[in-house]
C-alpha cells in the first residue's frame, strides 16, 4: 500500500544583496500567466548559478514569492511583477513560501522529499 503525498508549507524572509549580475533568478506566474491552477502567484522557475540567490542558498526553484520589500505580489500581472523586482534596489527582502513534499507511509512514517517545482 502506497503512502499519500502531503506538503509541508513554511514561510521565510530572505534578504538578498543584488550582485554584479543582479539577483539571479527567473519567475513565472501572475494574473495573466497562471503557473499553478487557480493561483496567480509568482513562483521561482530557475535560479542562476553564481547569482546572488544561488550564493545565498535559501531561495529554491518552486518557491512562491509572497512579497518584495514588503510589497505584496498578489494579483499582479506577470510583467508588473518583473518590473517590481527590477526596481527593488540594492538590498532586496523577499517573503517566500517553501513547499516541501512529505511522504506519509502506511504506518505514519514521515520522510521529507525535495521541494516541489
Amino acid at each position: 500500500m502506497n503512502g499519500r503525498v502531503d506538503y509541508l508549507v513554511t514561510e521565510e524572509e530572505i534578504n538578498l544583496t543584488r550582485g554584479p549580475s543582479g539577483l539571479g533568478f527567473n519567475i513565472v506566474g501572475g494574473t495573466d500567466q497562471q503557473y499553478v491552477s487557480n493561483d496567480s502567484g509568482i513562483y521561482v522557475s530557475r535560479i542562476k548559478e553564481n547569482g546572488a540567490a544561488a550564493l545565498d542558498g535559501r531561495l529554491q526553484e518552486g518557491d512562491k514569492i509572497l512579497s518584495v520589500n514588503g510589497q505584496d505580489l498578489k494579483n499582479l500581472l506577470h510583467q508588473d511583477a518583473v518590473d517590481l523586482f527590477r526596481n527593488a534596489g540594492y538590498a532586496v527582502s523577499l517573503r517566500v513560501q517553501h513547499r516541501l513534499q512529505v511522504q506519509n507511509g502506511p504506518i505514519g512514517h514521515r520522510g521529507e522529499g525535495d521541494p516541489s517545482g
Partner: nanobody, 127 residues
Framework: QVQLVESGGRLVQAGDSLKLSCAAS????????MGWFRQAPGKEREFVAG????????YYGDSVKGRFSISRDNARNTVYLQMNSLKPEDTAVYFC?????????????????????WGQGTQVTVS
Amino acid sequence: QVQLVESGGRLVQAGDSLKLSCAASGRTFSTYTMGWFRQAPGKEREFVAGTSPSGDNRYYGDSVKGRFSISRDNARNTVYLQMNSLKPEDTAVYFCAAFRGSCVDDGCDFRVSQYDYWGQGTQVTVS
C-alpha cells in the same frame, strides 16, 4: 523543456527583407522568454532581439534597432524575426533561444548565458 526549430534563412540581396520563424514544442510556450541571436564566422554569438512571455515587451540589439522586429504567436507556439533593409554585415547563422519565465535583472534578457534552450540555427547570407 522545449525544442526549437528555425526556418526562413536564405541568400538575399542587400536592402531586401526576410522573415525568420522559430517553431517551439510544448504546451507552455507562453511562459517562455524568447530571443534571437546570431553568430558570424569567427565572431561571438550576438543578441539580436527578445520578447517577454506575453509579447508585450520587446528589445533589440543596437545593430538592428529600427530594422528588425520580433513578434510571437503564442497560439501557434512560434516566434518571428522580421528583418528589413538587410546589410552584408547581417550575414550570420541566426539562432532562436528560450528560457522559462522572466529573469528579474536588468539586461538579463540580452545575455547568451541566460538562455537554456537553443535551436540549430538558420543561415542568412546578404550579398
